[in-house]
Interface confidence: low
Amino acid sequence: CKAMHVAQPAVVLASSRGIASFVCEYASPGKATEVRVTVLRQADSQVTEVCAATYMMGNELTFLDDSICTGTSSGNQVNLTIQGLRAMDTGLYICKVELMYPPPYYLGIGNGTQIYVIDPEPCPDSDF
């Protein structure tokens, strides 16, 4: 398994609507035609898979219909958006990139993006 460098921002603050976006950039050592991007969440030493998408270079990322992730790709950059986040989802979100095809297989794992999610204060009652 050949190593590959993956860069991602250290910290991102989710919007009041629970949406966080960040760029995951990988240093591709070869001309991959098929790339798999996985977002992993690390919290309390537990690692869980948030979402994953395989895409052909030049095409859109396709996540499952019920995925909380969406994304677009441009060259060696993947713009990832995670939706529906709540305060309890605060944690380290790691970008894992695999160059699936053609071989040789390359694997890169970023250092993670700490996503902070603050639940919005409920709106005070209004007369109008």
Epitope: E49, T54, P103
Partner: antibody, heavy 122, light 107 residues
């Protein structure tokens, strides 16, 4: 139904050569990465070789690199494993296996053949 | 290469019992683990991939769990056809390596 049938195993002397074949049916052979996996007499499983869909890319563990060659003929739906400089440690049941994802390179082995036995002994 | 260590190497159980087999990875493999079952004289069959996803046609009494370096395969209410050997295998890059196996025998 996916079917993988291996053949070509047998008894060979140390330093000898052997070519295994695996005939596939029940799926579009050219759409899948294929592999060989072996099981030693002690029942340990070891990945031996992988070849990409078009056959242009191959991968091997250090234990067989330079001695074994995986190839395929998509027109014949057949996978091959050419083994040379065989050693007693190569004695094993050799299985042909298909990866689960047609478009991916490194995953799990979703379908296995019944195996062909290779015995390396003087 | 990532070393995979299975335990126990063998165990005896009765029909109807629940058993758990564990697999430890030499480094973090996240959830990239598969489990296989092999019956005497047969080839291995895929049971679980991605640590917890059951392969097509696998009965729901089988369940996989774990992430990182510690994984387990649980079989609820053992049936006669469940006896045999079980192997774990990481699918976190190449080379894919297997655990040494666990032989499940009838008590």
């Amino acid at each position: 139904d996916v079917k993988l049938v291996e053949s070509g195993g047998g008894l060979v002397k140390p330093g000898g050569s052997l070519k295994l074949s695996c005939t596939a049916s029940g799926f579009t052979f050219s759409s899948y990465t294929m592999s060989w996996v072996r099981q030693t007499p002690e029942k340990r499983l070891e990945w031996v070789a992988t070849i990409s869909r078009g056959g242009g890319y191959t991968s091997y563990p250090d234990s067989v690199k330079g001695r074994f060659t995986i190839s395929r003929d998509n027109a014949k739906n057949t996978l091959y494993l050419q083994m040379s400089s065989l050693q007693s440690e190569d004695t094993a049941m050799y299985y042909c296996a298909r990866d689960d994802y047609g478009s991916s390179y490194v995953h799990w082995f979703a379908y296995w053949g019944q195996g062909t036995l290779v015995t390396v002994s003087a | 290469d990532i070393q995979m260590t299975q335990s126990p190497a063998s165990l005896s159980a009765s029909v109807g019992e629940t058993v758990t087999i564990t697999c430890r990875a030499g480094e973090n493999i996240y959830s990239y683990l598969a489990w296989y079952q092999q019956k005497q004289g047969k080839s291995p069959q895929l049971l679980v991939y991605n640590a917890r996803t059951l392969a097509e046609g696998v009965p729901s009494r089988f369940s996989g769990s774990g992430s990182g370096t510690q994984f387990s395969l649980k079989i609820n209410s053992l049936q006669p056809e469940d006896f045999g050997s079980y192997y774990c295998q990481h699918h976190y890059g190449s080379p894919r390596t297997f655990g040494g196996g666990t032989k499940l025998e009838i008590k």
